[in-house]
């Protein structure tokens, strides 16, 4: 058992049939000695008497808010939450496995550049009686500071009969060094409490591995005289790290016909312009990736050929 | 370069970009294969890293590129020795078409561009003997290549920026 915050405790339980559970001793926070009784949640049923109450916590029915009273007056409260461990693995019932980039991915994080700022998000089908807290650091044995902002509900989606909620948080490394080679990973820890269930989730990554640039901006097409070819140009996204001579991008360009089945030729270039054949009803697209490190490609930026 | 002369920025840029390509073809990203484990904070101390105070940022390069170039060269020699060690030459054997050989040669080539014959900067101690088990050796190869990818990415940025802004 450990204290999450004042008067709120997490009981760690091995969860299997006929498990013995954990013995917990609650102490009433009062100088009084006599006439003390204990109740659980809104029930008026007296569970025991005396300054301490010993309970065997085995299941969710044993968790909740315990109150000690004297003469009808509440003296103190203790809220017990449960953290389940099944077959040596902590439960992950609250958040949804996003399965990307691999199974058991509950937290996903991305960065638009090397500034030390990143966003993490997670999914759940639970709407009410659900709270989170987030902590982050660089390294774990001698952690360096990372400051995270508010967790906000960033999207709601209907998936069949279920509603899915996406929560996200933005964090910033306190002393980021964009040009250095990261040695220690960023650690992100999210704890989730649903009703009386406590769970925690962690993600560990280097910023370089979660980089995903914004799409290139200002796509422009200039037809070349007496030719089927057009000159296309684009610019680095505003959110990308500067100077661009140091933080360089590479680009993938393609012309996509109206039919999705039509063969697409992809060309890779480090330049911000190219000459392509752009037929009517087709569209030109470009995406960006760090030139020297194979992190994610940006989403496509597109413009119609006509 | 030693003694304060400028490197052949454009040549270094080309070779470092080639190194990036080779490092990724030697160990492509296998579904974000997570090779970090408990205690990795200690094991990562073994390899040289380009750190914040090494002057490899744009401002540091403008002020005095020598500190950064020396750090890069130390790292190149370190990795070149690693790729030539029995971690890579021992069992399990590399495939005949493995890019590790090319990678090894390119590391050597770039380190020599940074230090012509006759000049000697002190280099970092090369790591202790490799593990005996083939599976351990395989895992170590992956970790070294992942670490090398990060190192050469920073080096390539340095040379690209140098070629664009510091070339005579």
């Amino acid at each position: 058992i450990w204290e999450l915050k004042k008067d709120v405790y997490v009981v760690e339980l091995d969860w299997y049939p006929d498990a013995p559970g954990e013995m917990v001793v609650l102490t009433c926070d009062t100088p009084e000695e006599d006439g003390i009784t204990w109740t659980l949640d809104q029930s008026g049923e007296v569970l025991g008497s005396g300054k301490t109450l010993t309970i065997q916590v085995k299941e969710f029915g044993d968790a909740g808010q315990y109150t000690c009273h004297k003469g009808g007056e509440a003296l103190s409260h203790s809220l017990l939450l449960l953290h389940k461990k099944e077959d040596g693995i902590w439960s992950t019932d609250v958040l949804k496995d996003q399965k990307e980039p691999k199974n058991k991915t509950f937290l996903r994080c991305e960065a638009k550049n090397y500034s030390g700022r990143f966003t993490c998000w997670w999914l759940t089908t639970i709407s009410t009686d659900l709270t989170f807290s987030v902590k982050s650091s660089r390294g774990s044995s001698n952690p360096q500071g990372v400051t995270c902002g508010a967790v906000t509900l960033s999207a709601e989606r209907v998936r069949g009969d279920n509603k899915e909620y996406e929560y996200s948080v933005e964090c910033q490394e306190d002393s980021a060094c964009p040009a250095a080679e990261e040695r220690l990973p960023i650690e992100v820890m999210v704890d989730a409490i649903h009703k009386l269930k406590y769970e925690n989730y962690t993600s560990s990554f280097f910023i370089r591995d979660i980089i995903k640039p914004d799409p290139p901006k200002n796509l422009q097409l200039k037809p070349l005289k007496n030719s089927r070819q057009v000159e296309v140009s684009w610019e680095y996204p505003d959110t990308w790290s500067t100077p661009h001579s140091y933080f360089s991008l590479t680009f993938c360009i393609q012309v996509q016909g109206k039919s999705k089945r039509e063969k697409k030729d992809r060309i890779f270039t480090d330049k911000t312009s190219a000459t392509v054949i752009c037929r009517k009803n087709a569209s030109f697209s470009v995406q960006a990736q760090d030139r020297y490190y194979s992190s994610s490609w940006s989403e496509w930026a597109s413009v119609p050929c006509s | 370069v030693p003694g304060g002369s400028s490197p052949a920025w454009a040549q270094c840029q080309q070779l470092s970009q080639k190194l990036c390509t080779l490092a990724w073809s030697a160990h492509p990203l296998v579904g974000h294969m997570d090779l970090r484990e408990e205690g990795d904070e200690e094991t990562t101390n073994d390899v040289p890293h380009i750190q914040c105070g090494d002057g490899c940022d744009p401002q540091g390069l403008r002020d005095n590129s020598q500190f950064c170039l020396q750090r890069i060269r130390q790292g190149l020699i370190f990795y070149e020795k690693l790729l030539g060690s029995d971690i890579f030459t021992g069992e399990p054997s590399l495939l005949p078409d493995s890019p590790v050989g090319q990678l090894h040669a390119s590391l050597l080539g770039l380190s020599q561009l940074l230090q012509p014959e006759g000049h000697h900067w002190e280099t970092q101690q090369i790591p202790s003997p490799s593990p005996s088990q083939p599976w351990q050796r395989l895992l170590l190869r992956f970790k070294i290549l992942r670490s090398l990818q990060a190192f050469v990415a920073v080096a390539a940025r340095v040379f690209a920026h140098g070629a664009a802004t510091l070339s005579p």
Epitope: T131, A150, L153, Y165 | -
Partner: nanobody, 125 residues
Framework: EVQLVESGGGLVQAGGSLRLSCAAS????????MGWFRQASGKKREFVAS????????SYADSVKGRFTISRDNAKNTVYLQMNSLKPEDTAVYYC?????FGSGSYYDLMYDYWGQGTQVTVSS
């Protein structure tokens, strides 16, 4: 210093309506859920309603569902409780609460970190 100040309580006849307000000062509760609890004389403090930061996720005690509506105005840093079809058993001191955690809120008062001083609501029959 964080302060939550409730207002809008008073005496009302059964079937009537009241609107409680809770103004927060000292910090913005961006991302933080807020809630209303009540305590009748000689009884335990009980959950009434909670609302997330966006205002899109609300939760109510069964006893007030369909009669009470919780809402919030983040620009004013204020949360409201519109109480319709009031009954004598709604008589209690109503407390506003805010959590330092994020999400949609909790039924448990110990999960809230900041409290107002309370406003009395009396429903006469």
């Amino acid at each position: 210093e964080v302060q939550l100040v409730e207002s809008g309580g008073g005496l009302v006849q059964a079937g009537g309506s009241l609107r409680l307000s809770c103004a927060a000062s000292g910090r913005t509760f961006e991302g933080n859920p807020m809630g209303w609890f009540r305590q009748a004389s000689g009884k335990k403090r009980e959950f009434v309603a909670s609302i997330d930061w966006s205002g899109g996720i609300t939760s109510y005690a069964d006893s007030v569902k369909g009669r009470f509506t919780i809402s919030r105005d983040n620009a004013k840093n204020t949360v409201y409780l519109q109480m319709n079809s009031l009954k004598p058993e709604d008589t209690a001191v109503y407390y506003c609460a805010a959590s330092a955690r994020f999400g949609s809120g909790s039924y448990y008062d110990l999960m809230y970190d900041y409290w107002g001083q309370g406003t009395q609501v009396t429903v006469s029959s």
